[in-house]
């Protein structure tokens, strides 16, 4: 029997055991976060699946994810939202220590999808484990990209107080207008709820003592934010390892100097 023809995309296929992984992550999340104890993970998976199964994977819309996003009513306390761009690992290490601050991936929907890839095929109930659309080579309206755009928008919209963002000072564009932070989150912070955005620019080299807050792209970010009537602050984090250590042990004498 010849295998049925399948669309070939340029990106890697759906993560192995995707349904089982999402369901298991959901159950684990509800066990670790008792405020979500009443969430029915089978229903969450059904809504997730419904967003992309049987749909042409280059024609996914934010509307497709709305049933799932309706679940995302988890609220982050004011002053406790941490956004990040191109420096995910450090942001997550930080919130693992500073347990009262939250990245998108610390919320249920972000936690479910973190580091996963998925797509379906038009008019079949199958998941495509062979290939999925690549954002650049195939299309931007693919299931993964649209998911992150949708939940990132919602995450930014619900932020309040002083919002923090971690930026990678080792990159040529410390602030990149084309990143999810630059293209989605920045523009969906609500000025009536958000007093300020504080950027933490993370330095890469140990000997790097430049003031990266003066970088042209940071000035561009400041301009965008200020035009939205949100105040902007910037801090250099010269030693990320030291920074994390001081978050873990704030009483350490070497941390008290600020």
């Amino acid at each position: 029997v010849l295998p049925r023809w399948r669309q070939q995309w340029s990106g890697s296929g759906t993560t192995s055991r995707f349904p089982e992984t999402v369901l298991a992550r959901c159950v684990k999340y509800t066990e670790v976060h008792p405020e979500m104890r009443h969430v029915d993970c089978q229903s969450v998976w059904d809504a997730f699946k419904g967003a992309f199964i049987s749909k042409y994977p280059c024609n996914i819309t934010e509307e497709d994810y709305q049933p799932l996003v309706k679940l995302g009513t988890q609220t982050v306390p004011c002053n406790k939202t941490l956004l990040w761009s191109r420096i995910k690992d450090l942001a997550h290490q930080f919130t693992q220590v500073q347990r009262d601050m939250f990245t998108l991936e610390d919320m249920l929907l972000g936690y479910l999808a973190d580091d996963l890839t998925w797509c379906g095929e038009f008019n079949t109930f199958e998941i495509n484990y062979q290939s999925c659309p690549d954002w650049r080579k195939d299309c931007s309206n693919n299931p993964v990209s649209v998911f992150w755009k949708t939940v990132s928008r919602r995450f930014a919209e619900t932020a309040c107080g002083v919002v923090h963002v971690m930026l990678n000072g080792s990159r040529s564009k410390i602030f990149d207008k084309n990143s999810t932070f630059g293209s989605v989150e920045v523009h969906n912070l609500q000025p009536e709820k958000v007093q300020a955005l504080e950027a933490w620019v993370i330095h890469g080299g140990r000997e790097d003592s430049r003031d990266l807050c003066q970088d042209p792209t940071i000035k561009e970010l400041e301009s965008i934010i200020s035009k939205r009537n949100i105040r902007f602050f910037c801090k250099n984090i010269y030693r990320p390892d030291k920074f994390l250590q001081c978050v873990k042990n704030p009483e350490d004498s070497s941390c008290l100097s600020g």
């Epitope: 405020e35 104890r37 009443h38 969430v39 029915d40 229903s43 049933p67 309706k70 679940l71 009513t73």
Partner: antibody, heavy 118, light 110 residues
């Protein structure tokens, strides 16, 4: 076995205050979410408030928010409901309930009657 | 505040099967577990079903629960006289940040 015993109900005038207590035994009280649920005469069950374990987070029904305060004292294995600015529509039997790990009300007290009338 | 919708009454003869429906929305039943409680007048309510279809120990297997989309149902098979009671469904509601109960269904054994 699990026991939940409510007390503190009674007759109170509109605008008055009352504090309900729930004495818990037979389980590790500090581990569980706890709730108050009420039933007005001839009406159905209505959730009133819940309090989490750990550093307590509180949740309230819209009908009581700003007037009622749920609290707990883990050292005394006790749950409380402070009711202020009482109204006639708050007249009900108030039940104390223990929540299970999936949010279900696994155990209930026998209830205490609160009557708000002039 | 809007609760969950249940029929006010249901009845059947001894030994029959009775089903009670409970309808809600995506903010409650849609994404959250459904619970069922039995309430006999003058007694404390009793948990019958949790996590949509799970029975606590001690609850007879004549009671079964199911959920589909934004609706749920409780079935009582082999109806007995002691099943005469009020039955309530409940679920967490995201839009209210609290639990919602159904209006209650009075089951009568004819």
């Amino acid at each position: 076995q699990v026991q939940l015993v409510e007390s503190g109900g009674g007759l109170v005038k509109p605008g008055g205050s009352l504090r309900l207590s729930c004495a818990a035994s037979g389980f590790t009280f500090s581990d569980d979410y706890m709730s108050w649920i009420r039933q007005a005469p001839g009406k159905g069950l209505e959730w009133v408030a819940s309090v989490s374990n750990g550093r307590p987070t509180t949740y309230y029904a819209d009908s009581v928010r700003g007037r009622f305060t749920i609290s707990r004292d883990n050292a005394k294995n006790s749950l409380y409901l402070q009711m202020n600015s009482l109204r006639a529509e708050d007249t009900a039997v108030y039940y104390c309930a223990r929540e299970g790990w999936s949010g279900e009300f696994t155990d209930w007290g026998q209830g205490t009657l609160v009557t708000v009338s002039s | 505040q809007a609760g969950l919708t249940q029929p006010p009454s249901a009845s059947g003869t001894s030994g029959q099967r009775v089903t009670i429906s409970c309808s809600g929305s995506s903010s409650n039943i849609g994404f959250h577990f459904v619970y069922w409680y039995q309430h006999l007048p003058g007694t404390a309510p009793k948990l019958l079903i949790y996590k949509n279809n799970q029975r606590p120990s001690g609850v007879p297997d004549r009671f079964s629960g199911s959920k589909s989309g934004n609706s749920a149902s409780l079935a009582i098979s082999g109806l007995r006289s002691e099943d005469e009671a009020d039955y309530y469904c409940a679920a967490w509601d995201d839009s209210l940040s609290g639990y919602v109960f159904g209006s209650g269904t009075k089951v009568t054994v004819l």
